[in-house]
Amino acid sequence: QTSVSPSKVILPRGGSVLVTCSTSCDQPKLLGIETPLPKKELLLPGNNRKVYELSNVQEDSQPMCYSNCPDGQSTAKTFLTVYWTPERVELAPLPSWQPVGKNLTLRCQVEGGAPRANLTVVLLRGEKELKREPAVGEPAEVTTTVLVRRDHHGANFSCRTELDLRPQGLELFENTSAPYQLQTFVLPATPPQLVSPRVLEVDTQGTVVCSLDGLFPVSEAQVHLALGDQRLNPTVTYGNDSFSAKASVSVTAEDEGTQRLTCAVILGNQSQETLQTVTIYSFPAPNVILTKPEVSEGTEVTVKCEAHPRAKVTLNGVPAQPLGPRAQLLLKATPEDNGRSFSCSATLEVAGQLIHKNQTRELRVLYGPRLDERDCPGNWTWPENSQQTPMCQAWGNPLPELKCLKDGTFPLPIGESVTVTRDLEGTYLCRARSTQGEVTRKVTVNVLSPRYE
């Protein structure tokens, strides 16, 4: 009778095992082992027992001990089970960004691994098991579908293999794939809202605001603002699920014409874009030309208003005749015209909008001096010892200097509060003088003494 020890062995792939073949008869004609594995016999005393070292065991094998005794031939098999963990545990590649609400199929592929009966494939989200299945086929494939939720953002999905050899007295061998980090996002179907001037003047700055609600995660949204080829540099402020991107846009004469303003929001692998046209125009303020800004009374003055060739002007509220970019008026300068404003208003239509520009010039009329009865009375009668304020106003431009002297030596304190004395009585010569000339006027002060009352 032939026997083998051990009758069952589990060993790692490529490992070695000692197998003892024994027979019950004392003098066997033959005792050996039949195996394709590399073997080495260990020398032992006696004839009825042999020990072999079987090496480089790569797969399950059933070496067979045999013996030939006088009472006949017999055999005994030992069962070698090879174990090894999978060579590849991999999640099928997926885009890292996934829109919320999409069904996401996770596919795990496992190559190798034995014994397959003890090999299980587990799909996980973090530490939570999503699916557990035995490894079947080569490569083994396990799939599961996940409905992408907002709270999955940043979650790690992985695949784990478990080779459970604990029933065989060994341990549980685990292999885990590289994790797949899921980035979830929500990009609404509505395009971003773009607020900007429809028209923009050359050499000015405009403000462009692009905003969108209902984004997740809002901090990951990329905003691209551009006017034509000019990339804008916005300042972005974020809300819980919204953003607002504000940028200043400067335009020059080179940008004149119709330009395309774009706002693109990129989140995950999706984008939303809004386009708008902006008309860039040049419209200098109209020019108000006075023949001379400062003239003497009685001078003929021409006031001209000139504007952009396509503009329509009004000068002091009067439209140009015919309606167009030029207007003019003529006047003879009077003192009342001093300080008079000549205002030219120009209107230009740009992309359906009316743009208004104004320019104002002031006329200075030099006149005078003047001294008249109304502002410089010729006669004052005041009681002695009373408090009085002599008033005499000279008019003119420039404002004349005024002095009132009695006998060429005594000044009358114009505009000052004086105590009336007999010294104040008399006739004063008031002289108003400016660069425009000189006028004189006599003013008499009468003092009423108490004895005359």
């Epitope: 200097e401 002095k403 002297l405 009695k406 006998d407 060429g408 030596t409 005594f410 000044p411 304190p413 000052e416 010294d423 010569l429 002289r431 003088r433």
Partner: antibody, heavy 120, light 110 residues
Framework: EVQVLESGGGLVQPGGSLRLSCAVS????????MGWVRQAPGKGLEWIGI???????YYASWAKGRFTISKDNSKNTVYLQINSPRAEDTAVYYC??????????????WGQGTLVTVSS | DIQMTQSPSTLSASVGDRVTITCQAS??????LSWYQQKPGKAPKFLIY???KLASGVPSRFSGSGSGTEFTLTISSVQPDDFATYYC????????????FGGGTKVEIK
Amino acid sequence: EVQVLESGGGLVQPGGSLRLSCAVSGFSLSSHAMGWVRQAPGKGLEWIGIIGSSDRTYYASWAKGRFTISKDNSKNTVYLQINSPRAEDTAVYYCVRDPYDSYDEGYRLWGQGTLVTVSS
Amino acid sequence: DIQMTQSPSTLSASVGDRVTITCQASQSIYRYLSWYQQKPGKAPKFLIYDASKLASGVPSRFSGSGSGTEFTLTISSVQPDDFATYYCQQAYSSGSIDNAFGGGTKVEIK
């Protein structure tokens, strides 16, 4: 050009009489007042008096009686008569255009002055 | 009678100093006050009229202020050419007066 030029100064004996002249040009005496100011050696300015455009005269209280201001519009000349000069009348005498004429800004127009020395 | 009182009578200053001279009238002369500068052997030079108006050609470091009875002449930064005697003169009344001028202030080098 507006100018004033004093003359008539020099050495005079106490108790005698002296008349200083002031010739003006560039303006009319009929419309301007003219005054006299003196300055004793090492002393301050002292106002003597003024003749108005109407020929009326005004004097400092100490000058009344011994000092007389007059003018001749046709000759465009103003005069200062000093009666009974005393040693304390020794001074430089300035003829000045009115103290506050319109636009002429106070004693703006001064002559170069004429020195009167009262000594026996 | 209107009397004019000037102070101080003498004032010592260094080049660059700020100098202030005051003039007081015994009754209101409104703004009818002039200031003069006189150097030895020369006729007085007109500086300021109407209390604060600068006569033509006068440097802007000179300024005048005041009205009524109190007046001030200020030299913001005294220059070597400014060492002289300064007089105020009232130009309001030519009647019943002793002297239209203040007693003078001599500004000398410290």
